[in-house]
């Protein structure tokens, strides 16, 4: 914390300006007015304080505005907005998407720090819902923030959101987000021609249902293992091992190495030994030849 | 990477005259505004003086009259000429980009004027 001294002669803060970086810490704390930060807080992201000067500003409005600042202040912080702490923004009401999209900027390139997320945090409980607008800034600004939302939070995303999304942004969503933001992704990606089409809905597939696995398998698409590798098993366990085949291209002969785990696992228990040995990779573990396979949950529909 | 190299201190009686120099590589130089920085023992770090890409020069109350900024484009190299050196002069300085907004840090040059 600065000492109080008094400001020297002369020195006294008439305005917000260049001349302020000369000033050592003490005499910004003694010659600088709170109430004419305040007003003039847009200057202050232009003039090249260092961070040991941006912290006695900081002070200063701190003791202005001890409940929080207001929305005008929070608006200009500009560099100042990286030495508030999660607590300081908890006392803040941001209601302005400019105000927002100007403290997201500040934090561009830069992975999502607590203080963004407890801004963004704030900025949806103030502004009571998380609506298309809102969703839009966040995915341009953190792509990956997708995966952090509900998938009730999710189903209000626009599709025009998807083309943001960077596969790595998915990395951290789970099959039950996945299942909201493939359709999503389908709806974006629709007037894409076939081999375009696929690298882009490639990342979503963890959402994908059976019918769209065996129209992939019917265009070439070579998925490789990794992918296959999270796709649902339930949407999985229906194909047949020709439209595995297919789907997977040359990459099929990988089913080996993942013959243990799922989804190829419990895929494998699924086929005909018989319709397996075609692959000639020697997987294991099919249907015995000569055994009848009952659908019970088929049996049940019908009584 | 920016890299930022100061040379030129030294002990000196008052009233005499150094040159401090700072290479600078990794960046756009030219395009920059630069800074000279110094902390006295026991003090804070205060900004000195400053130069930006278009020329125009600024200086600390305490150095103006005396102290000279400059630079040379074609050597990614500004200047500090001190004249009329004061033992309140007596400080580590330190050049930096003004977009960096570190201030005092790293190595600098010591600067020691005896009365």
């Known amino acids: 914390e600065v000492e109080k001294t008094a400001c020297p002669s002369g020195k006294k803060a008439r305005e917000i300006d260049e001349s302020l970086i000369f000033y050592k810490k003490w005499e910004l704390e003694a010659c600088v007015d709170a109430a004419l930060l305040a007003t003039q807080m847009d200057r202050v992201n232009a003039i090249p304080f260092t961070y040991e000067q941006l912290d006695v500003l900081k002070h200063k409005l701190d003791e202005l505005y001890p409940q929080g600042y207001p929305e005008s202040v929070i608006q200009h912080l500009g560099y100042l907005f990286l030495k508030m702490s999660p607590e300081d923004i908890r006392k803040w009401n941001v209601t302005s998407l400019e105000t927002l999209k100007a403290l997201l900027e500040v934090n561009k390139g830069h992975e999502m720090s607590p203080q963004v997320a407890t801004l963004i945090d704030r900025f949806v409980k103030g502004r009571g819902q998380l609506d298309k607008d809102t969703l839009d800034t966040l995915t341009a600004f953190y792509p990956g923030y997708l995966c952090s939302l509900s998938p009730e939070e999710l189903s209000s995303v626009p599709p025009s959101s998807i083309w943001a999304v960077r596969p790595q942004d998915l990395d951290t969503c789970d099959p039950r987000q996945l299942d909201v933001l493939y359709p999503k992704a389908r709806l974006a990606f629709q007037n894409m021609n076939g081999s375009e089409y696929f690298v882009k809905i490639q990342s979503f597939l963890g959402g994908a249902p059976t019918e769209d696995l065996k129209a992939l398998s019917q265009q070439n698409v070579s998925m490789d293992l990794a992918t296959f590798m999270k796709l649902r098993t339930d949407a999985v366990l229906p194909l047949t091992v020709a439209e595995v085949q297919k789907l997977l291209g040359p990459h099929v002969e990988g089913l080996k190495a993942e013959e243990r785990h799922r989804p190829v696992r419990d895929w494998i228990l699924r086929q005909r030994q018989d319709d397996l040995d075609t692959l000639g990779l020697g997987l294991q573990g099919g249907i015995p030849n000569g055994y009848l396979v009952l659908d019970l949950s088929m049996q049940e529909a019908l009584s | 990477e920016v890299r930022l190299v100061e040379s030129g201190g030294g002990s000196v009686q008052a009233g005499e005259t150094l040159r401090l120099s700072c290479t600078a590589s990794?960046?756009?130089?030219?395009?920059?505004?630069m800074g000279w920085y110094r902390q006295a023992p026991g003090d804070e770090c205060e900004l000195v003086s400053t130069?930006?890409?278009?020329?125009?020069?600024n200086y600390a109350d305490s150095v103006k009259g005396r102290f000279t900024i400059s630079q040379d484009n074609a050597k990614n190299t500004v200047y500090l000429q001190m004249t009329s050196l004061k033992p309140e002069d007596t400080a580590i300085y330190s050049c930096?980009?003004?977009?960096?907004?570190?201030?005092?840090w790293g190595q600098g040059t010591l600067v020691t004027v005896s009365s």
């Open positions: 930096r980009t003004m977009a960096s907004r570190i201030g005092c």
């Open positions: 990794g960046f756009t130089f030219d395009d920059s505004d």
């Open positions: 130069i930006s890409s278009d020329g125009s020069t």
